[in-house]
């Protein structure tokens, strides 16, 4: 039997044991989060699979993920949404300590897909473990990119009160309009529900005392937000290590001074 021709993409293939990983993560998540105990993880996997299996992996739409989004519906209390851009690890360390704040990856759908890659093949029920489309080199409408765009949009749309965003002050573009935050989340905050966006600019160098809130890209962010009539605030986090320490132990005497 001749081996069937398989499309070669520029990106790495589906994460090994992808179905098992998604299912296991779902089970773990629903056990830990009582409000999601009603979720049937097999149905979640079926909906996830249905979004990309048998479909051309450069032609995935947000519509393909709607059944999954519906099953994973979750609400974050007002003032408790934390967005991030190019600084995922610190954002996650923060919400692990500050348990009442949530990043997208603290929600079921984000938790399921975090750090995973997946894609299928047109007209077959197989998962492609060899290669998947790269956003830049192949196409933007690939299963992974469309998933994150879809769930990020939804996460931003449902945010309310004061929304926080953690930004990487070590990057040349602290606010990057091409990031998921800059291209999706900012534009989907709902002005009738969101009173303000507060940016936390995380400094990299220990001796960096500059006011990065005056960075031109931050002013650009304020410009975008202001047109939507959402208030904008910005804080420098000069010492991220101390910042996390003070979240853990707010009574610590050293936490009374600036971070």
């Amino acid at each position: 039997v001749l081996p069937r021709w398989r499309q070669q993409w520029s990106g790495s293939g589906t994460t090994s044991r992808f179905p098992e990983t998604v299912l296991a993560r779902c089970v773990k998540y629903t056990e830990v989060h009582p409000e999601m105990r009603h979720v049937d993880c097999q149905s979640v996997w079926d909906a996830f699979k249905g979004a990309f299996i048998s479909k051309y992996p450069c032609n995935i739409t947000e519509e393909d993920y709607q059944p999954l989004v519906k099953l994973g519906t979750q609400t974050v209390p007002c003032n408790k949404t934390l967005l991030w851009s190019r600084i995922k690890d610190l954002a996650h360390q923060f919400t692990q300590v500050q348990r009442d704040m949530f990043t997208l990856e603290d929600m079921l759908l984000g938790y399921l897909a975090d750090d995973l890659t997946w894609c299928g093949e047109f007209n077959t029920f197989e998962i492609n473990y060899q290669s998947c489309p790269d956003w830049r080199k192949d196409c933007s409408n690939n299963p992974v990119s469309v998933f994150w765009k879809t769930v990020s949009r939804r996460f931003a749309e449902t945010a309310c009160g004061v929304v926080h965003v953690m930004l990487n002050g070590s990057r040349s573009k602290i606010f990057d309009k091409n990031s998921t935050f800059g291209s999706v989340e900012v534009h989907n905050l709902q002005p009738e529900k969101v009173q303000a966006l507060e940016a936390w600019v995380i400094h990299g160098g220990r001796e960096d005392s500059r006011d990065l809130c005056q960075d031109p890209t931050i002013k650009e962010l304020e410009s975008i937000i202001s047109k939507r009539n959402i208030r904008f605030f910005c804080k420098n986090i000069y010492r991220p290590d101390k910042f996390l320490q003070c979240v853990k132990n707010p009574e610590d005497s050293s936490c009374l001074s600036g971070i």
């Epitope: 309009k177 709902q190 031109p216 890209t217 650009e220 410009s223 202001s226 047109k227 009539n229 904008f232």
Partner: antibody
């Protein structure tokens, strides 16, 4: 005193080109998003284009997309509008205006007239 | 055809109160910044109302504005002859990524 001063307008044949300039003074030019707005004779205001603070991002009205290019030189406190392949319907007074956060198009220049006619 | 809809003309006698309406949609007026501009004959537009309802310094308190849903309105009380001008509403439009204007209302003081 906060001021915007446009220049570069004139009479040009259809298909021709013009480059408009807008010199800013009295405020920190590099802190503001900048815009071009035009007004055809006897008509209303029409937004043409805007450019972000850093100049990295530009936006255009559908009517000028692909023909006009907005740019800025923060070191010279100057905004530009390169207009190519001009049409009769581009005839208008062209104003530059800064965008002030939470205010709107705050300060406007006096305008420069562009006439496209054969 | 303007994205925002304004009446082409309005008039009133000195001392009267005149209101100019501006109608839009969710992507502009409802959720975003709305401004009003005054353009006196032969001059550049001037920002009259910023941030939906605020008067920049130097604008008389005879000018006021309101916003409700997808509509906005400008009210001028104690009308004066120097108020004779064109008035434009404008808003940022999310879906177009553009500033959109009303067609303008020519105010005549009789």
């Amino acid at each position: 005193e906060v001021q915007l001063l446009e220049s570069g307008g004139g009479l040009v044949h259809p298909g021709g080109s013009l480059r408009l300039s807008c010199a800013a003074s009295g405020f920190t030019f590099s802190d503001y998003e900048m815009n071009w707005v035009r007004q055809a004779p006897g008509k209303g205001l029409e937004w043409v284009s805007s450019i972000s603070i850093t100049g990295d991002f530009t936006y255009y009205a559908d009517s000028v997309k692909g023909r006009f290019t907005i740019s800025r030189d923060n070191s010279k406190n100057t905004l530009y509008l390169q207009m190519n392949n001009l049409r009769a319907e581009d005839t208008a007074v062209y104003y530059c205006a800064n965008y002030k956060s939470y205010y709107g198009l705050d300060v406007w220049g006096q305008g420069t007239t562009v006439t496209v006619s054969s | 055809q303007s994205v925002l809809t304004q009446p082409p003309s309005a008039s009133g006698t000195p001392g009267q109160r005149v209101t100019i309406s501006c109608s839009g949609s969710n992507s502009n007026i409802r959720y975003n910044l709305v401004n009003w501009y005054q353009q006196l004959p032969g001059t550049a537009p001037k920002l009259l109302i910023s941030n939906n309802v605020q008067r920049p310094s130097g604008v008389p308190d005879r000018f006021s504005a309101s916003k409700s849903g997808t509509s906005a309105s400008l009210a001028i009380s104690g009308l004066q002859s120097e108020d004779e001008a064109d008035y434009y509403c404008a808003a940022w439009d999310d879906s177009l990524n553009a500033w959109v204007f009303g067609g303008g209302t020519k105010l005549t003081v009789l």
